[in-house]
């Protein structure tokens, strides 16, 4: 669809005569008839296949024709066509004399013709005007013409309809050849697909408008390149959605079970060495001078009763000092200047002379010890309590206070934690050195198999087209992560890619 435009510029008829040579009275009131038709090697009369147009009276004898687009497109003259422009044409321009006001062909005498010109040739669509001048014996006509496409028609022959649009069926303008030129941020055959935020993950992200990045289920982050771990995952990460891969030192389905209490909580004090011994379980090895489960208690250096022969111990900043009783000397009052005559044996001990009276030895009654029977017996010095039990002196005897899970006089017996059937939902119980462990049946988890979890929804391989399946334990369902080019909850539908 387009328009053949003819711009009349000047008509010269100096003598004011008709084609027959007869003069017009009082002058030639001139109007034009234009016939546009298909190309003919010799232009002949006949149907004006591309259209016709007539002008009103434009002047008398010789005159210039003013541009006038306001009066219904009078000059240039418009010859619209609703077909593909063929690139060739024939044009007939007739100048007529109008004796009266009726310009209809049937109202004019045949000899009212002033002049007739006919041209033919090639004409490409374009904005540029072609200037032409046709001269006969008595007249001259100067004019220009061109073919332009109608609004929304494009291409070399005005055959391509294209209307710019900016709605969900396309976001584009039209190029001179009629092809679409997408507006910024849009792509696709009809410019209907938004260009997502730069870097938005191809499979895990999408958008409904440009520079957006919306995440598919299981993904998060500005570019939808971060997986969402399993709901409730505490100390773990994921490489694919709904996973919970535990950080070092953590265990369990939700990575909430502390397997490295020593590192995470540093329970041992005063430079003691910490050893992990199970979930939330540890042992502290104290440096000399400290005691307690966490080595939190400072031992006095005198607590080990280093002074012999009844010497009294005094704590000092850099250690201790023994105050020896009469007749003894040395760092620990270990040397005697006494003999049996000095009654050196305390607490009912009996004295025996040695080395011809130069020395002696005390034989102590039960519950007393030391070279002078000056010390009560500490029945705990030999560490008789096993499995970390704490030894307590109780008069002439001793007792062991056992750690959880142990019993017996010396804490030598391991209590079976499984005896009370702690594993729920048919879990199998295993005794460990530091407690117990439950092996849970399918569908259950937790330390005691008390947590109901979903059976692996991915076990049946529900995803198609090499999609990755993730079990969503929170909803007992699966999620398929589709490869590029497939959609659907099971990735079963191929996408018609542009």
């Amino acid at each position: 669809s387009g328009v053949f435009q003819l711009q009349l510029q000047e008509f010269i008829n100096e003598r004011g005569v008709l084609a027959s040579g007869r003069p017009c009275e009082p002058g030639c009131r001139t109007f034009f008839r234009v016939c546009l038709k298909h190309f003919q090697a010799v232009v002949s009369p006949g149907p004006c296949t591309f259209g016709t147009v007539s002008t009103p009276v434009l002047g008398t004898n010789s005159f210039a024709v003013r541009d006038d687009s306001s009066g219904g497109g009078r000059n240039p003259l418009q010859l619209p066509f609703n077909f593909t422009w063929p690139g060739t044409f024939s044009l007939i321009i007739e100048a007529w004399h109008a004796p009266g006001d009726d310009l209809r062909p049937e109202a004019l005498p045949p000899d009212a013709l002033i002049s007739k010109i006919a041209i033919q040739g090639s004409l490409a669509v374009g904005q540029n005007w072609l200037l032409d001048e046709q001269t006969s014996t008595l007249t001259r006509l100067r004019y220009s013409y061109r073919v332009i496409c109608s609004d929304n028609y494009y291409g070399d022959n005005c055959s391509r309809l294209c209307k710019k649009r900016n709605d969900h069926f396309g976001h584009y303008v039209c190029q001179p050849d009629g092809n679409l030129s997408c507006l910024p941020g849009w792509t696709g055959e009809y410019c209907q697909q938004p260009i997502c935020l730069s870097g938005c993950h191809e499979q895990n992200g999408y958008c409904s408008k440009p520079a957006e990045c919306l995440c598919r289920p299981g993904w998060q982050g500005r570019l939808c390149n971060e997986c969402i771990p399993h709901n409730g995952c505490r100390h773990g990460t994921c490489s694919t959605p709904w996973q919970c891969t535990c950080d070092e030192g953590w265990g369990g389905l939700f990575c909430d079970q502390d397997l490295n209490y020593c590192t995470h909580h540093s329970p041992c004090k005063n430079g003691a060495t910490c050893s992990n011994s199970g979930q939330r379980s540890y042992t502290c090895t104290c440096r000399p001078g400290y005691t307690g489960v966490d080595c939190e208690l400072e031992l006095s250096e005198c607590d080990s009763n280093p002074c012999r022969n009844g010497g009294s111990c005094k704590d000092q900043e850099d250690g201790y000092h023994c105050l020896c009783p009469p007749g003894y000397y040395g760092l620990h009052c270990e040397h005697s200047t006494l003999s049996c005559a000095d009654s050196p044996c305390f607490n009912g001990g009996s004295c025996r002379e040695r080395n011809q009276g130069a020395n002696y030895a005390c034989e102590c009654p039960p519950n007393f010890t030391g070279s002078n029977c000056e010390k009560k017996v500490d029945r705990c010095t030999s560490n008789p309590c096993a499995n970390g039990g704490q030894c307590l002196n109780r008069g002439p005897s001793r007792m062991c206070r056992c750690r959880p899970g142990f019993t017996g006089t010396y804490c030598e017996l391991h209590v079976s934690d499984c005896a009370r059937n702690p594993c729920a939902h048919g879990g199998t119980c295993h005794d460990l050195e530091n407690g117990l462990m439950c092996t849970c049946p399918a569908g259950f988890s937790g330390r005691r198999c008390e947590v109901r979890t979903s059976i692996d929804a991915c076990a049946s391989s529900p995803c198609f087209n090499r999609a990755t399946c993730y079990t969503d334990l929170s909803t007992d369902t699966f999620v398929c992560n589709c490869p590029y080019g497939f959609v659907g909850s099971r990735c079963e539908f191929p996408v018609g890619l542009p």
């Epitope: 929304n152 209307k163 649009r165 709605d167 069926f169 209907q192 409904s208 539908f493 996408v495 018609g496």
Partner: antibody
Framework: EVQLVESGGGLVQPANSLKLSCAVS??????????WGWIRQSPKKGLEWIGD???????YYNPSLKSRVTISVDTAKNTFYLQMDSLRSEDTATYYC?????????????WGQGVLVTVSS | DYRLTQSPASLSASLGETVNIECSGQ??????ASWYQQKPGKSPQLVIY???KRPSGIPSRFSGSNSGDQASLKINSLQSEDVATYYC?????????FGGGTKLELK
């Protein structure tokens, strides 16, 4: 050949909600070449476009109905839906689902058979 | 709100006659117009899209044009099976808009 079949119509009480389904067969709803739309027709208002949806989930609604309408898609079931809330008597109409082709400038080249919805107490 | 006005609302024509149905709307020529035929008790059927294109299966006697503020549907040599109501449709931004319809009957 692609076919669209609506379901879920019938008598609905005023102020209640309605959910219509449009099952697509003979072609994939996940095609990038089409939007899937809902249009209704009543003697009083003639044909009235309600809204449409792309397979990605992008939706467009008639501004006059937007506050009461939700269109959704289930690509696995090859079905799209129209949910309409707070129904009134003037929502009584035959509801059509249609395929709107990008290659046809948005023209609806396939229609369902229509389903009658009557809103009345 | 964008409006499409169809004229006439109804018309009677004889078999073999040429029928013209008009659809007017502000700057309609800058939009793509579609035309639908709906027979009683049936769903609408697309007969013209993008102003003047015919879907496959639509007879060549149906033609369309669109410029300025007006789109037209022309039916050459009217046949009995053409008796129906015809609707024009266009898109205004992201909203579909239909004309009020023209009921075509046989004389």
């Amino acid at each position: 050949e692609v076919q669209l079949v609506e379901s879920g119509g019938g008598l609905v009480q005023p102020a209640n909600s309605l959910k219509l389904s449009c099952a697509v067969s003979g072609g994939s709803i996940s095609s990038s070449s089409y939007y899937w739309g809902w249009i209704r027709q009543s003697p009083k208002k003639g044909l009235e476009w309600i809204g449409d949806i792309y397979y990605t989930g992008s939706t467009y609604y008639n501004p006059s109905l937007k506050s009461r309408v939700t269109i959704s898609v289930d690509t696995a079931k090859n079905t799209f839906y129209l949910q309409m809330d707070s129904l009134r008597s003037e929502d009584t109409a035959t509801y059509y689902c249609a395929r709107q082709a990008l290659a046809m400038g948005g023209g609806s080249d396939k229609w369902g058979q229509g389903v009658l919805v009557t809103v009345s107490s | 709100d964008y409006r499409l006005t169809q004229s006439p609302a109804s018309l009677s024509a004889s078999l073999g006659e040429t029928v013209n149905i008009e659809c007017s709307g502000q700057r309609l020529g800058d939009k793509y117009a579609s035309w639908y035929q709906q027979k009683p008790g049936k769903s609408p059927q697309l007969v013209i899209y993008e102003d003047s294109k015919r879907p496959s299966g639509i007879p060549s006697r149906f033609s369309g044009s669109n410029s300025g503020d007006q789109a037209s549907l022309k039916i050459n040599s009217l046949q009995s099976e053409d008796v129906a109501t015809y609707y024009c449709q266009a898109w205004d931004r992201d909203t579909g808009v239909f004309g009020g319809g023209t009921k075509l009957e046989l004389k």
